[in-house]
């Protein structure tokens, strides 16, 4: 059968699986003359021959772990034994069975972890070895904790990444350890192969013994520190401390004030480096980081909170440089005449804020001094001795002084004396008639004038007319504004007039003055007015309750999950009808009629968070008409994105042969979301087989070292699995494969004989 | 033990030709291979080509190539060179010689070789 | 064509004498190279294959080196009857060629 068992010299791949006794040939050469005859050599360990025929057979069972990858050249040869055709690569792949059990490197393993350590952040590894292929289930593990001792209330302190071996803490490991309760806990570990899902698994355990530290990366207490200080700056105010030394602190200001007025040191001692103004702000929240070597975060950063404390360094300030007020003539005794309100920046309801005032002079002193009085704390004036006359004195002034405990200021108040407010406000005309407006007439459109006379002083408060409207008008959707000069008052639309709630209002209006009548007078049916406001039907589109609708869900949320509702009301009280516009992504649907909107699709953060999309309300019947509002549909992360490189890492090198071991670094990422601290990635050998030529070791959560053992690497490429872990909630492995050349190398760059110019490297290391 | 007996000196004129024979005794012909050389008088070894009696597989240099054929006889053990057009740059000792390599064995070279037949082309 | 150079033609030797004969090939040959032994109206004999493996009954005073493109015979303990014309041979590639010949003669 040519082809398949059988034909001419040509490279060639074969796969046979490790274990099993030959029962069949691999392949038949066929010779063209002047070759009469074949040749075999290369990895043959005596298993693979080849016969004068051409026949290519092995003797005896393979062991992949022994070898994974036969390569053999066949050569055709003449009957001189001259080679004539080839030679050519043969290569036999040895396919993996599961035959041998996974090993733990220790059976014991110690450790320590510290109190409030972050959850899933791994602080010891226990490592398992299986000779068989880690690119099958056979070599693939499996970690699980057995038991934990002592297990309080059946709570489970501590966790295992059940593909690298990563012990952390839980959620509430972080919560609860504490190593005065319990300083020391054991745990028993089994590892699996095949994945830990069949029952013909190899397995084996280990003993994990762990120490329980102090946790000294604590917020300290909050700090005071009063304003204005004269000592000598930086001062020292707190501390914070990361558990090992080394740590390198920083000051993040979230607030990203202009000044930002604390540093700290690399003992982590914190300091405010200049005066703090408490009237500038008052209080200062930030945080400290402790990094490791490489610009690392190490834990989550401590909130620092600084309360700038008062002191009594601002004066009283007057409202203004000069307060006026009226009084009638014929006033009370008693009666308040207004109210001065000074102010002082310093803390509020404290000693340095709380005022005093005190009439120092009153000009003129006619008919006499002492004709009126402050109340002490209040600022109030009222008349104190008699009723005043106009025509004796139309205008006093008084100075006041207002004081704090430390400083005093002088406020200068004006009182004008009026004539009597004994003449009412009188409208023109009490009825204004019936208006008819759409309900979609313009908001700020005037849309009546009224006037009404005052026979009092001119220009004062007894002559000066406010207007109200004292009924029909609960929605408060008209004003009027009153015209200083001439008392004219312009009705105007505040609010959207609505046919649908009032087709028909009956506005009146009310106008008085700001002064108080004299006694005896009242405001009569002069002073009210009244018109009828009719309001016509526009057909109007449905109105959404919110401009833009936000909901909030995580990533992973499964099909058919209720992400969140939109409502509308239409005007006219008809049906309404929702839809979705710009679901560009197909990830949800809406249900017409309630406005809930669901999910149709898997969530992908990755793609874009928040998610936007229109909802549309239509009227249901009538003149359909629609409205739009916006819907955002903020995504979670969900740590479901394995670490990958961050790179196309084709090209890697070395100069064969090597003088002394080497190394290179590579960059893993993710596309999961990583706020303050950013990835924090662990690194291993993808299969036990790499242990003896490679290793690989952590820089930092981003970056690793593959470093060779040895110097007795064959010239040709390598393919270095790795596995990327990313320790999140459930940690995520991704395996990556590095492929490395060992090359010869011709003034530092891989040499290349004419003609094999396929897939050169192009970065030595 | 191994002989290669060949034919004995010839004298020929020019435009004529000549075959050789060699035969061969203590081995089977066909498990090796049969090469020719031919040694001009104080000069060095020129090899003509060889012949594979088992597949009859001949490769000659290309400069004798017009010159020789190569053939065997499996039935009486013996090889033969035939050469054609002599001319007196033929006159030469013409040797046969097995070539010690088959199937398995690490030997190589010109191990057993005839006693030479002399050629002399005049006319 | 692979050229075989012997550059020595004729070599003075004396009985007990160390003799080395080289042989280079205008191209890698690796080691497909043979020696042989000719004496004046004989046959050549088969000293050395390989480059270094000494042929079935060879005395162990011939020795052969070298790979690639150069090649040395050598004679560590030179007799009477050593005296004769020592050809190479390479095998690597066809046409298959010999070189010129190195005649050792007594001094």
């Known amino acids: 059968q040519e082809g398949k068992f059988s034909g001419p010299l040509k490279p060639m791949t074969f796969s046979i699986y490790e274990g099993q006794e030959p029962s069949q040939i691999i392949f038949q050469f066929k010779a063209n003359p002047p070759a009469v005859t074949f040749e075999l050599t290369g990895e043959t360990d005596n298993i693979f021959v080849i016969e004068r025929e051409g026949l290519l057979y092995y003797n005896r069972a393979l062991d992949r772990e022994t070898r994974s990858t036969h390569n053999l050249q066949v050569a055709a040869l003449d009957a001189n034994g001259i080679i004539v055709e080839g030679p050519v690569p043969i290569t036999i792949k040895v396919k993996d069975i599961n035959d041998n059990r996974p090993t733990f490197l220790q059976s014991k393993y110690e450790g320590s972890v510290r109190q409030n350590s972050r959850p899933g952040k791994p602080f010891l590894y226990v490592n398992a070895t299986d000779l068989d292929d880690p690119a099958t289930p056979n070599g693939q593990l499996y970690y699980q904790i057995v038991i934990q001792l002592p297990m309080i209330n059946n709570v489970m302190y501590f966790q295992i990444n059940n593909k690298t071996g990563a012990i952390s803490l839980t959620r509430e490991g972080s919560q609860e350890l504490n190593p005065a309760k319990n300083p020391s806990y054991n745990l028993v570990i089994s590892v699996k192969d095949m994945g830990g899902q069949s029952e013909n698994s190899f397995s084996d355990t280990t003993s994990v013994d762990i120490i329980v530290t102090e946790n000294i990366w604590k917020a300290p207490k909050p700090v005071e520190m009063v304003e204005n200080s004269t000592d000598p700056h930086p001062i020292k105010i707190t501390q914070v401390r990361w558990n090992d030394p080394g740590a390198q602190y920083s000051l993040v200001d979230k607030e990203k004030l202009p000044r930002f007025p604390f540093s700290i040191d690399q003992e982590g001692d914190i300091y405010v480096t200049q005066p703090l103004d408490r009237e500038e702000k008052d209080a200062y929240v930030f945080y400290a980081v402790a990094k490791d070597e490489y610009g690392k975060p190490l834990s989550y950063p401590l909130e620092i909170h600084v309360k700038v404390k008062d002191i009594n360094d601002n004066p009283p300030t007057c409202p203004s440089p000069v307060t006026v007020f009226e009084v009638q003539e014929n006033e009370r005794l008693g009666n308040s005449i207004g109210t001065l309100t000074a102010h002082d920046r310093d803390e509020e309801n404290t000693a340095n804020s709380f005022l005093n005032y005190r009439i120092v002079e009153q000009t003129p002193k006619l008919p006499m001094d002492g004709l009126f009085l402050i109340q002490t704390y209040a600022g109030m004036l009222q008349l104190a001795k008699q009723s005043l006359k106009k025509q004796d004195t139309p205008q006093y002034n008084l100075t006041i002084e207002v004081s704090d405990k430390d400083f005093k200021t002088l406020c200068f108040v004006q009182i004008n004396v009026i004539d009597i407010n004994d003449q009412i406000p009188i409208f023109e005309k009490s009825d204004y008639g019936n208006l008819t407006l759409a309900e979609d007439t313009n908001i700020g459109s005037t849309i009546l004038t009224i006037q009404a006379t005052d026979a009092d002083e001119p220009f004062t408060g007894s002559s000066k007319i406010l207007y109200h409207i004292i009924k029909g008008d609960s929605e408060g959707r008209l004003g009027v504004d009153t015209d200083p000069h001439t008392n004219t008052g312009y009705v105007i639309i505040k609010k959207p007039l609505d046919f649908e709630t009032a087709a028909v209002s009956n506005i009146v209006f009310k106008a008085e003055n700001p002064e108080p009548l004299v006694f005896g007078v009242k405001y009569n049916a002069s002073s009210f007015a009244k018109f009828t406001l009719i309001v016509t039907d526009v057909n109007e589109a449905p109105q959404f309750s919110q401009h833009v609708f936000q909901a909030k869900v995580s990533e992973d949320v499964a099909i058919g999950t209720k992400v969140g509702n939109v409502t509308a009301k239409d005007p006219e009280g008809l049906d309404i009808s929702y839809s979705l516009r710009g679901d560009t992504r197909g990830w949800l649907k809406i249900d017409h009629v309630t406005g809930e909107i669901f999910s149709v699709a898997p969530l992908d953060r990755e793609a874009g968070s928040p998610y936007r999309v229109q909802v549309v309300a239509t009227e249901v019947g009538g003149s359909s008409l629609s409205s739009v509002s916006e819907f955002h549909l903020i995504l979670m992360d969900v740590n479901d994105n394995p670490p990958r490189l961050a790179k196309d890492y084709t090209g890697l090198f070395f100069c064969h042969p090597l003088s002394a071991p080497g190394s290179l670094i590579f960059e893993a990422t993710d596309d999961d979301q990583h706020l303050f601290r950013g990835p924090h990635f662990t690194f291993s050998l993808g299969s036990g087989s790499l242990q003896n030529d490679w290793e690989v070791s952590k820089i930092n959560g981003t970056h690793a070292r593959l470093s060779t053992r040895h110097t007795e690497f064959e010239e040709r490429e390598y393919v270095v699995l790795i596995r990327i872990n990313d320790g999140g909630r459930p940690p995520l492995e991704g395996i990556v494969s590095l492929p490395v050349t060992f090359c010869s190398c011709v003034e530092g760059s891989c040499f290349r004989p004419a003609g094999h110019q396929t897939g050169i490297p192009t970065v030595g290391m | 033990q191994v002989q290669l007996q060949q034919s004995d000196a010839e004298l020929v004129k020019p435009g004529a030709s000549v075959k050789i024979s060699c035969k061969v005794s203590?081995?089977?012909?066909?498990?090796?291979?049969i090469h020719w050389m031919k040694q001009r008088p104080d000069q060095g070894l020129d090899w003509i080509g060889y012949?594979?009696?088992?597949?009859?597989?001949?490769q000659y240099n290309e400069n004798f190539k017009a010159k020789s054929t190569l053939t065997a006889d499996k039935s009486s053990s013996t090889a033969y060179m035939q050469l054609n057009s002599l001319t007196s740059e033929d006159s030469a000792v013409y040797f046969c010689a097995r070539w010690s390599w088959h199937f398995g064995s690490n030997y190589y070279g010109l191990d057993y070789w005839g006693q030479g037949t002399s050629v002399t082309v005049s006319s | 064509d692979i050229v075989m150079t012997q550059s020595q033609t004729f070599m003075s030797t004396t009985v007990g004498d160390r003799v080395s004969i080289t042989c280079k090939a205008s191209q890698n040959v690796g080691t497909a190279l043979a020696w042989y032994q000719q004496k004046p109206r004989q046959s050549p004999k088969l000293l050395i294959y390989?480059?270094?493996n000494r042929f079935t009954g060879v005395p162990d005073r011939f020795t052969g080196s070298g790979s690639g493109t150069d090649f040395t015979l050598t004679i560590s303990n030179m007799r009477s009857e050593d005296l004769a014309d020592y050809v190479c041979?390479?095998?690597?590639?066809?046409?298959?060629?010999f070189g010129s010949g190195t005649k050792l003669e007594i001094r």
């Open positions: 390989s480059a270094s």
């Open positions: 012949i594979y009696p088992r597949d009859d597989i001949t």
């Open positions: 041979q390479q095998y690597s590639t066809y046409p298959l060629t």
């Open positions: 203590g081995y089977t012909l066909t498990d090796h291979t």
